[in-house]
Interface confidence: medium
């Protein structure tokens, strides 16, 4: 009478789940660091580079004490979605100079996408409230020049590196609180 019941569902160990997310984040941090170094070697940065469309920094030493898992994962996911969009834009509109960063930029995009899916899975496995679907973001204007694309690349990779760096620290801290 119907198929036999499947094996009992084992609820995942949240620390192990978080561990694998930390590993992915660390791996992406290393990739981003290497790509940012490659960019600096090919196109040395003169001073700091900003892009208004990038997310503002979400973490610092002072914020660590009040960190909570739902807030961190939701914010991290939102910020990484923004960076994914910026990396896609960079590959599409960044100009011929940035083609020299391929295939690494494509690999970075794929790994960023993988981390985002991992965060989504982690949130559902931990039964955290799912954030509402993201409203469509306004399209990013193409860089005004080849140099504009390079400056944008410095800003995007620098911001992503900093975001991932804090993400690793925050996730490690949260793991100890589970």
């Amino acid at each position: 009478p119907g198929p036999p019941p499947g094996p009992p569902r084992v609820s995942p160990d949240p620390r192990a789940e978080l561990d694998s997310t930390v590993l992915l984040t660390r791996s992406l941090l290393a990739d981003t660091r290497q790509l940012a170094a490659q960019l600096r070697d090919k196109f040395p940065a003169d001073g700091d580079h900003n892009l208004d469309s990038l997310p503002t920094l979400a973490m610092s030493a002072g914020a660590l004490g009040a960190l909570q898992l739902p807030g961190v994962l939701t914010r991290l996911r939102a910020d990484l979605l923004s960076y994914l969009r910026h990396v896609q834009w960079l590959r599409r509109a960044g100009g011929s100079s940035l083609k020299t960063l391929e295939p690494e930029l494509g690999t970075l995009q794929a790994r960023l996408d993988r981390l985002l899916r991992r965060l989504q899975l982690l949130m559902s496995r931990l039964a955290l409230p799912q954030p509402p679907p993201d409203p469509p973001a306004p399209p990013l204007a193409p860089p005004s020049s080849a140099w504009g694309g390079i400056r944008a690349a410095h800003a995007i990779l620098g911001g992503l590196h900093l975001t991932l760096d804090w993400a690793v620290r925050g996730l490690l801290l949260l793991k100890t609180r589970l």
Epitope: R26, L29, A45, G47, D48, H49, N50, L57, S60, A61, G62, A63, G158, G159, H161, L162, D165, W166, V168, R169, L172, L173, T176
Partner: antibody
Framework: EVQLLESGGGLVQPGGSLRLSCAAS????????MNWVRQAPGKGLEWVGV????????FYADFVKGRFTISRDNSKNTLYLQMNSLRAEDTAVYYC??????????WGQGTLVTVSS | QSVLTQPPSASGTPGQRVTISCSGS????????VNWYQQLPGTAPKLLIY???LLPSGVPDRFSGSKSGTSASLAISGLRSEDEADYYC???????????FGGGTKLTVL
Amino acid sequence: EVQLLESGGGLVQPGGSLRLSCAASGFTFSHYDMNWVRQAPGKGLEWVGVISYDGSNKFYADFVKGRFTISRDNSKNTLYLQMNSLRAEDTAVYYCARTPGSHFDYWGQGTLVTVSS
Amino acid sequence: QSVLTQPPSASGTPGQRVTISCSGSSSNIGNNAVNWYQQLPGTAPKLLIYYDDLLPSGVPDRFSGSKSGTSASLAISGLRSEDEADYYCSAWDDSLNGVVFGGGTKLTVL
């Protein structure tokens, strides 16, 4: 290129005060937490304290609490360390260091503070 | 007395592999990332390893880090004379609410 340049060190008497500065360039200063770390002559590294990127939070080592104050001026890309009630054991090279997460990825060259009568 | 414990000295001959240990507790190494710094004579410290085993740009892959429980170690393979320096481990300490360092290990290349 990221650069951190400390200044303001010198000779001061016990009980005196001194203000160190750290001028930052080559990166978006307002995005990074900043630290002070010191090293007494012939000794190891000792963390002094950290200030968050927007200046809203500060943490200090126990040995400086109430005597030292870290501040920053993001419009001037400058980090400060105000040192009061100085003691002989505060004699050290003081370094400023940038923190992107849990580590210090760039350090200044250091400025020597000598506390002696 | 440093919160993290390192051997005061270590030595090796060119080409050899040396390791430097760093032991702590659950409030620092056990729960937080370990970082390693190299300080060449007369210079400021330089980041060598972060998040236990990641290498910053420009650091040769002869350097590697590892962590297990409340201990960490730095390994240097293919030792060179320019590796002669002081090496420090570091981690955030949850109890002290601050960064702690090891006492430093002076590496001599014989």
